[in-house]
C-alpha cells in the first residue's frame, strides 16, 4: 500500500552541521545584509564518513517569464496574479571529486533535497530550525520509513501504445555524453489539490514544496538534455475543481477533462501534472497518458507519498517519462540501467522501490529520442523566456528586491529618512538607507571598523568606503599561524 | 483587525539564549512578510529579523549568525531564536505582520504590544 501517512519518517540519519564555505570576496548584486540568497554557494558536509563539497548554482531557468499563480482569495472568487522580480533559494549543482555526480536542494530554511555520489542518492533535510548551519538529517532513501509505490500504468496499455519492445533498438551511447540535439523543453503546469493543500497549510508551503519538487524534476531531466520549466502553479486553496478520486485513473480522466475546459483561459502549456495529497487505491502512486505530450492528453497525477519532497520528484519525473513515450524498463528485453546501479533503480522502473531513483535507463533514453522524431513533439523544441526571479518586488516587505533601492516598510511604519517609502528609492541626496556602513544616509569612510573579530580565527572587517555594506565575514585559512 | 501577540521574553545572562513567539490572529490574508523590531531606550526602533512569504530572511550585520527566525504556517506564528546574547541586544521586541487583502492591493502593517528581552552581564 502506498504509504496512508504521507510524512513518513526516517528509520536512520547521520547528523550534519553544513558548513558554508567563503565565498569570493567580492561585491555581490545585493547588499549582503540582507540575507538573499547568493548565486552560488558551497557546503561542506560531514556525512558517512566522508566530506562532501557541494557546489550549488541557483536555478535560474525554473521558472517561465509569464509564470503564473491561482488560488482562491478570501471572498471565494479564483485569482490569477503574475508575480515578478523576487529572489529564490533553489539551487542545483554537483559534488567535489565526483565526476558523475548531481545536486539538486533548497537553502530556504535550511537544506533540504538531494545529492547523488557513485550509486548513492543522499537525502537531507533540517532537523530543528537552526537554518543552514543547524542539524541536518542526511540519509538514503530506503531508510525513509515507506513502502514501495507502483506506475498505474499498465503493461497491456504500453504495449498497444509502444509496440514490440527488443533490446536491439537500444544501443547505449558511449559514457554519460549528452544527446547531441538541442536542448528540449518542458513547459509545466502544476495543479495541487485541496488535500495537499491541508496537508501542507498554506499557500506559501505549497509554493514552496513545488517549486522545489520541479527544480528536482528539472535536475533528473538534464542528463537527457531536457529542461523541466515551471510555466504556472494553481493551488485549490478552498476546494477542489473536479473530483479527487483515489481511483488514480478516474483522477487523471478527470484532470485532462477539465484541462480541456481551462485552456483558453489558462497559461499555454507543454504539459499539466496534478499533485495530490489523496492517498490512492493500493500501491499507486502516480499514473499518466503514454505519448501525449504536446497534446491535449499531456497529463498525469501524482500521489505525494513522502516526507521528502524527492519522493514525489522521481514520481512526476516517471509519469512525465510516460507522457514522453517511455515505457516501464522491465518490460523492454535487455534494457540497461547502467550497471553500476542495481535493476530497478532507474526512473522507469515500474515500482518507484523504498529508494529513490536518479536516472534514466538506455532503453528510457531510445524511446525519448524516438518520440522526439514524431512532428507530434514540436511543443518541446521552444524554448521558454525564462523568468530570471521568482514573485514580484513589494515595496514595503522589509526586502530589498529588484529595481528597489532601498526597503523600510510600508510607508505608516518607515522611520528611514534615507528610504522614500512609497516607492523604495533613496531619498534625494542619500547615498544609501541600509547597512552597516551607512551612517546618516551616507557611505561610511574607508576604514572603519565595521565587523570586530570574534575569535582567533576571524578577521575583523572594514567598510570601503563605496558600499554601504560591511563585506562578507572572512577568517584564516586553517594551519594559518 | 489583526492581533499579535509576543512571548518570551525576560531576563537572561550574557552568551544565553531566549526564544521569543508570535502568534496571529484575526482577519489574516495574505501575509507578505513577519518580523522582529527592537527599540532599546533612547534609540530608534530598528529591524532585528524578517521572513517573507516565500521563507526568504533578512538579517542585519548585528544579529547575523546569532539570530535565527522561523515561522509555523499552520499556526500563523513567527519565533525568534537568539543565541550569544550581549547587553546590547536589551530592548523591548515588537512582532510585526505586513499583510494585504488581494492581489496588489495595498500593504497593512500589524504590531504585537512588545516583550523585554534583558540582557545582563
Known amino acids: 500500500i502506498a504509504p496512508s501517512r504521507p510524512w513518513a519518517l526516517m528509520e536512520q540519519y547521520e547528523v550534519v552541521l553544513p558548513w558554508r564555505l567563503p565565498g569570493p570576496r567580492v561585491r555581490r548584486a545585493l547588499p549582503s545584509h540582507l540575507g538573499l540568497h547568493p548565486e552560488r554557494v558551497s557546503y561542506v558536509l560531514g556525512a558517512t564518513g566522508h566530506n562532501f563539497t557541494l557546489h550549488l548554482r541557483k536555478n535560474r531557468d525554473l521558472l517561465g517569464s509569464g509564470y503564473t499563480e491561482t488560488y482562491t482569495a478570501a471572498n471565494g472568487s479564483e485569482v490569477t496574479e503574475q508575480p515578478r522580480g523576487q529572489d529564490h533559494c533553489f539551487y542545483q549543482g554537483h559534488v567535489e571529486g565526483y565526476p558523475d555526480s548531481a545536486a539538486s536542494l533548497s537553502t530556504c530554511a535550511g537544506l533540504r533535497g538531494f545529492f547523488q555520489v557513485g550509486s548513492d542518492l543522499h537525502l537531507i533535510e533540517p532537523l530543528d530550525e537552526g537554518g543552514e548551519g543547524g542539524r541536518h538529517a542526511v540519509y538514503q532513501a530506503e531508510h525513509l520509513l515507506q513502502t514501495a509505490g507502483t506506475c498505474g500504468v499498465s503493461d497491456d496499455s504500453l504495449g498497444s501504445l509502444l509496440g514490440p519492445r527488443t533490446a536491439a533498438v537500444f544501443r547505449p551511447r558511449p559514457g554519460d555524453s549528452l544527446p547531441s540535439r538541442e536542448t528540449r523543453y518542458v513547459e509545466l503546469y502544476v495543479v495541487v489539490d485541496n488535500a495537499e493543500f491541508q496537508m501542507l497549510g498554506s499557500e506559501a508551503a505549497v509554493r514552496h514544496r513545488v517549486l522545489e519538487v520541479v527544480n528536482h524534476v528539472d535536475k533528473l531531466y538534464q542528463k537527457l538534455n531536457f529542461r523541466v520549466v515551471l510555466v504556472g502553479l494553481e493551488i485549490w486553496n478552498s476546494q477542489d475543481r473536479f473530483h479527487v478520486s483515489p481511483d488514480p485513473s478516474v483522477t487523471l480522466e478527470n484532470l485532462l477533462t477539465w484541462q480541456a475546459r481551462q485552456r483558453t483561459r489558462r497559461h499555454l502549456h507543454d504539459n499539466v501534472q496534478l499533485i495530490t495529497g489523496v492517498d490512492f487505491t493500493g500501491t499507486t502512486v502516480g499514473f499518466a497518458r503514454v505519448s501525449a505530450m504536446c497534446s491535449h492528453s499531456s497529463g498525469a497525477v501524482n500521489q505525494d507519498h513522502s516526507k521528502n519532497p524527492v519522493g514525489v520528484a522521481c514520481t512526476m519525473a516517471h509519469e512525465m517519462g510516460h507522457n514522453l513515450g517511455m515505457d516501464h524498463d522491465e518490460n523492454v528485453q535487455g534494457c540497461r540501467c547502467q550497471e553500476r546501479f542495481e535493476a530497478g533503480r532507474c526512473i522507469m522502473a515500474g515500482s518507484i522501490g523504498s529508494s529513490f531513483p536518479r536516472m534514466f535507463s538506455d532503453c528510457s533514453q531510445a524511446y525519448l529520442e524516438s518520440f522526439l522524431e514524431r512532428p507530434q513533439s514540436v511543443c518541446l523544441a521552444n524554448a521558454p523566456d525564462l523568468s530570471h526571479l521568482v514573485g514580484g518586488p513589494v515595496c514595503g516587505n522589509l526586502f530589498v528586491e529588484r529595481g528597489e533601492q532601498c526597503d523600510c516598510g510600508p510607508p505608516e511604519d518607515c522611520r528611514n529618512r534615507c528610504c522614500n517609502s512609497t516607492t523604495c528609492q533613496l531619498a534625494e541626496g542619500a547615498q544609501c538607507a541600509h547597512g552597516t556602513c551607512c551612517q546618516e544616509c551616507k557611505v561610511k569612510p574607508a576604514g572603519e571598523l565595521c565587523r570586530p573579530k570574534k575569535d582567533m580565527c576571524d578577521l575583523e572587517e572594514f567598510c570601503d568606503g563605496r558600499h554601504p555594506e560591511c563585506p562578507e565575514d572572512a577568517f584564516q585559512e586553517n594551519g594559518t599561524p | 483587525e489583526v492581533q499579535l501577540v509576543e512571548s518570551g521574553g525576560g531576563l537572561v545572562q550574557a552568551g544565553g539564549s531566549l526564544r521569543l513567539s508570535c502568534a496571529a490572529s484575526?482577519?489574516?490574508?495574505?501575509?507578505?512578510?513577519m518580523a522582529w523590531h527592537r527599540q532599546a531606550p533612547g534609540k530608534q526602533r530598528e529591524l532585528v529579523a524578517a521572513?517573507?512569504?516565500?521563507?526568504?530572511?533578512n538579517y542585519p550585520d548585528s544579529v547575523k549568525g546569532r539570530f535565527t527566525i522561523s515561522r509555523d504556517n499552520f499556526k500563523n506564528t513567527v519565533y525568534l531564536q537568539m543565541n550569544s546574547l550581549t547587553p546590547e541586544d536589551t530592548a523591548v521586541y515588537y512582532c510585526?505582520?505586513?499583510?494585504?487583502?488581494?492581489?496588489?492591493?495595498?500593504?497593512?502593517?500589524?504590531w504585537g504590544q512588545g516583550t523585554q528581552v534583558t540582557v545582563s552581564s
Open positions: 510585526n505582520l505586513i499583510q494585504r487583502r488581494a492581489p496588489y492591493s495595498r500593504l497593512e502593517t500589524y
Open positions: 484575526g482577519n489574516i490574508f495574505r501575509i507578505e512578510t
Open positions: 521572513i517573507r512569504s516565500d521563507d526568504m530572511t
